[in-house]
């Protein structure tokens, strides 16, 4: 059982544990999300992502979650259960990112560019909100991310 993001294989990640961690904080996160009209991981970001694109896209999205979302939210929360859940998610995201090695070959430029444009849509939506709201919304949308990642899961 592993993820196949195009040519990038990821082993040792148990999706069950990601869901368990997310569900432990979902109600809290989504209750704090007051901007229900906006979505960060909108349709255009995740729909019809080719296998080749998927490695680049998941790499950039998870890196963003690690460097911007978890890191900043960690400094703002004190609840032990919440911290534990985010640690589980972050550790697994690190494990995924560490195994992703998207090709930097020139012939992959258009695919890399397409994935980057998708990521920019997400980042733009994130930056349009104030920091607190953006972090809360990004965390509340981890389920959207996990659901999309299932498309690349192999039994």
């Amino acid at each position: 059982q592993e993820f196949h993001f195009g040519p990038c294989q990821v082993k040792g990640v148990v999706p069950q544990k990601l869901w368990e961690a997310f569900w432990a904080v979902k109600d809290t996160m989504q209750a704090q999300d007051n901007i229900t009209s906006a979505r960060l991981l909108q349709q255009e970001v995740l729909q019809n992502v080719s296998d080749a694109e998927s490695c680049y896209l998941v790499h950039t999205l998870l890196e963003f979650y690690l460097k911007t979302v978890f890191k900043n939210y960690h400094n703002r929360t004190v609840e032990v259960r919440t911290l534990k859940s985010f640690s589980t998610l972050a550790n697994n995201f690190v494990l995924i990112v560490s195994q992703l090695q998207p090709s930097q070959e020139n012939e992959m430029f258009s695919i890399r560019d397409s994935a980057h444009r998708r990521f920019l849509l997400f980042r733009r939506a994130f930056k349009q909100l104030d920091v607190e709201a953006a972090l809360t919304k990004a965390l509340g949308e981890v389920d959207i991310l996990l659901t999309w990642m299932q498309k690349f899961y192999k039994l």
């Epitope: 979902k26 729909q47 389920d143 659901t147 999309w148």
Partner: antibody, heavy 119, light 108 residues
Framework: EVQLVESGGALVQPGGSLRLSCAAS????????MSWVRQAPGKGLEWVSH????????FYAESMKGRFTISRDNAKNTLYLQMNSLKSEDTAVYYC????????????WGQGTQVTVSS | SYELTQSPSVSVALRQTAKITCGGD??????AQWYQQKPGQAPVLVIY???RRPSGIPERFSGSNSGNTATLTISGAQAEDEADYYC???????????FGGGTHLTVL
Amino acid sequence: EVQLVESGGALVQPGGSLRLSCAASGFTFDDYAMSWVRQAPGKGLEWVSHISGNGHSTFYAESMKGRFTISRDNAKNTLYLQMNSLKSEDTAVYYCAKDDYGSGLYAYWGQGTQVTVSS
Amino acid sequence: SYELTQSPSVSVALRQTAKITCGGDNIGSKSAQWYQQKPGQAPVLVIYADSRRPSGIPERFSGSNSGNTATLTISGAQAEDEADYYCQVWDSSANAAVFGGGTHLTVL
């Protein structure tokens, strides 16, 4: 080899209660979420309930909330469904299913147990 | 709540191609599964994650998912493929699995 064996199905009167069990083997039970899915006579599949591997998260179909309770005993590798205030429309074959992703990827199913609610 | 729509029945001539569709709002953003069920038997997973085949499932079964429609394709349908087929997704906003109403495939 993954095996799921349901039991506890019976004929019960409206308003009555029943507890279904699903004995699991062939995999590390507490690593996997599990679900109950039912099928009324001549009808399609209907999701009933979900429980995470650690048992901390439980979800139910709207029409079953408050009447049904899903639980698991990881030491016994067994999944349960406690059904109260049963109605005639709960008559169905009840299947337990192993969730291989944690959010509705049912790669393995039991053979089902028949629940009949009738006076 | 999220709904999936399947046509009740589809017929196909032996060894021809059958297509069974499953409609749902923006289903392309979700991961779609397909299950085969024969009379008196438990469902069997034939396609998961839109287009992946579990081991033991014949190559004639394939799937796709885009926009508002997921499709199960059986290329060169065999008599043993006659069964009910159900699509299914996870609705993360409701924390619930959702099944389509099912399609009965008849192989002529």
